[in-house]
């Protein structure tokens, strides 16, 4: 049944579709963008973790307009996937429960079998999601790829595709700042360089506050990493912009250690102002 | 290393004026002072050791009044820009890092009750 | 053997919770959708959920979200269903039943005995 | 959610009539992937219900060949040729097309 007049089962199951998606709910998934290449995924590893693989499989006639040549009922339909160390499966998941198909893993979960349907009838599609742990990707992992075939007891010739990804380590660091006043205001006299003692004489004060926040791990193992501030300190033709009085890191250093920044700010030995002492 | 990308250039180039008296409001130009068109930058770089949640960098600096008295008496408003960044220096090859640098403009204006004082 | 072995009859004060089992026996526990039904007494059926032994994902009906938790053990073969803060509303006969499989089996084709909850203060 | 409206509520029959209920969906019963996902079950007086008949015309293994079912789209029937005394008890239609499931009020089949 479901053969054709030969009574041969010719399947023509495809790989319609197949690609790495982030996982935004237990069954909504969002494609990762891909690489310049349109081939391969970019996954960036900032504390996702697991990382969908959307499968659409169909058993359609390869040509429409001699649909009895294949595309026969595919018995025994299964999808084989072979997973990275780095990638664990964890769970299938369907936008439709009646498209979910029985995915089985051995015991270290890097080899899965997934039933189509027995059997997986002639003019069927389904979609559903790998759900896969990331928990194996280190530092050092630069690429995920994973094995699919597809296979059935019906006559077709089957062979292997590859999804890949390139992993990149985001790092999940953000920044802002504010300055205390926002507006200033210039007046009083023209006086010299030479003639400045204390920092009252210079002009307005100005405090600059830049946050950086680090959500996920600590940064530490993974490079040496630093905070940089441009700071206009002359105009064009070489004269004082904003000049540079004390400059304070608290944080990144370790607990109740303040940081030393370079170069040394108030280059012209300025008093301080005593309300800032 | 994975640090920002030069600041664009501001679309115009003010010269600083070279007269300091008096200009009508409706002369006045809005100028921008931004590294490295407009201004020239000195970068103070911090090291970050032991980074678990937050940094806090603070600066204290001061205008140099001389300078704009001389230089920006005929210009309406001054937009100072002050720019911060993160960089990441790792054997990593693989290391991205988004959001990471920030931009905080001060705009100065010459004091409306200032007497100026040649 | 019985396929899907309820737990007994509970008689639970309003607001304390209820947990019931469904032992399943005789076929592979992940290989089917785990689904409960709630009957109150001369009524008709109400869907509660479903729940998928191989993975737990669950799938409830939105009129349950709040009151129904559908949880297994593949260690023991056994679903569970917890009902929280029950009312008088909630006393009534909950089945486990057995769905399928990969668009085949949307009925439920094994049911356990029925597990009697009475609510009453 | 998709109502089932199921009629009568009571039907009396002799033993060895033919007995019809009838079961009538708020929307199509026809899913996406071609199926029609309307099952038919039997609830005997102090039991649990039991399957009789899947996607709308498959009778379940053991289920004997005076049942029968039909329909389309939103409209089905259950037909019985030859009622018989175990025949006797509580029938649901119900759908699992939509979210969620849903079954029909229940048909009581009883001895006139």
């Known amino acids: 049944q479901g053969c054709g007049q030969d009574k041969i089962c010719q399947s023509n199951l495809q790989l319609e579709r197949y690609q790495f998606c982030s996982r935004i709910s237990d069954t909504e998934f969002q494609a990762l963008p891909m690489d310049l290449d349109g081939r391969t995924a970019l996954f960036a590893l900032s504390g996702q973790p697991f990382i969908g693989l959307e499968l659409t499989v169909t058993n359609l006639p390869s040509d429409p307009s001699r649909p009895q040549a294949d595309g026969d009922d595919a018995h025994e339909a299964q999808l084989l996937v072979t997973l990275p160390a780095s990638l664990r499966y964890s769970g299938v998941r369907a936008l439709d429960s009646v498209e979910k198909p029985l995915c089985l893993s051995n015991d270290s979960a890097s080899h899965v079998e997934c039933e189509l349907g027995n059997p997986m009838k002639r003019g069927a599609q389904v979609t559903f999601y790998l759900i896969l742990s990331t928990s194996g990707i280190t530092i050092e992992t630069t690429e995920l790829e994973v094995k699919l075939l597809l296979a059935t007891i019906s006559e077709q010739e089957l062979d292997p595709v590859s999804v890949r990804a390139h992993v990149f380590i985001e790092l999940p660091l953000s920044i802002s700042g504010v300055a205390t006043p926002q507006q200033l205001f210039f007046s009083g006299e023209v006086k010299g360089e030479s003639a400045m003692r204390s920092e009252r004489e210079l002009g307005r004060k100005v405090k600059y506050e830049v946050t950086v926040s680090n959500q996920g791990q600590s940064l530490n193992t993974l490079g040496s990493a630093n905070l940089n501030i441009m700071w206009p300190h002359e105009i064009a033709n070489g004269k004082w912009l904003l000049y540079p009085m004390r400059v304070e890191l608290e944080g990144g250093q370790g607990p109740g250690k303040r940081g030393i920044c370079s170069p040394r700010p108030n280059i012209l030995q300025l008093d301080v102002d005593s309300r800032d002492r | 290393e994975l640090g920002q990308p030069e600041p664009q250039e501001p679309p115009e180039k003010v010269e600083p004026s070279t007269s300091w008296w008096p200009v009508s409001s409706a002369e006045k130009r809005n100028m921008t002072l931004d590294c490295p068109r407009t201004a020239k930058c000195v970068v103070f770089s911090c090291p970050l050791y032991s980074f678990d949640r937050a940094a806090v960098l603070h600066v204290w600096g001061r205008l140099w009044n001389s300078t704009f008295l001389e230089e920006y008496m005929a210009v309406k408003s001054l937009e100072v820009i002050v720019r911060a960044n993160i960089t990441v220096k790792s054997s990593i090859k693989n290391l991205l890092l988004r959001d990471a640098s920030t931009v905080i403009p001060v705009m100065v204006y010459l004091d409306p009750m200032a007497v100026v004082v040649e | 053997q019985v396929p899907l072995q309820q737990s007994g009859p509970q008689l639970v004060r309003p607001g304390a919770s209820v947990k019931i089992s469904c032992k399943a026996s005789?076929?592979?526990?992940?290989?089917?959708?785990m689904h409960w039904v709630k009957q109150r007494p001369g009524q008709g059926l109400d869907w509660i959920g479903k729940?998928?032994?191989?993975?737990?994902?669950?799938r409830l009906n939105q009129e349950f979200r709040d009151k129904a938790t559908l949880t297994v053990d593949k260690s023991s073969s056994t679903a569970y269903l917890q009902l929280s803060s029950p009312t008088s509303e909630d006393s009534a006969v909950y089945y486990c039943a057995r769905g399928g499989y990969f668009g085949e089996g949307w009925y439920f084709d094994v049911w356990g005995a029925g597990t009697t909850v009475t609510v009453s203060s | 959610d998709v109502v089932m409206t199921q009629i009568p509520l009571s039907l009396p029959v002799s033993l060895g009539d033919q007995a019809s209920i009838s079961c009538r969906s708020s929307q199509s019963l026809v899913h996406r992937n071609g199926n029609t996902y309307l099952h038919w079950y039997l609830q005997k007086p102090g039991q649990s219900p039991k399957l009789l008949i899947y996607k709308v015309s498959n009778r379940f293994s053991g289920v004997p060949d005076r049942f029968s079912g039909s329909g389309s789209g939103t409209d089905f029937t259950l037909k019985i040729s030859r009622v018989e005394a175990e025949d006797l008890g509580v029938y649901f239609c119900?759908?699992?097309?939509?979210?969620?499931?849903?079954f029909g009020g229940g048909t009581k089949l009883e001895i006139k």
């Open positions: 729940i998928d032994p191989s993975d737990s994902e669950t």
């Open positions: 119900s759908q699992s097309t939509h979210v969620p499931w849903t």
């Open positions: 005789g076929y592979s526990f992940t290989r089917y959708w």
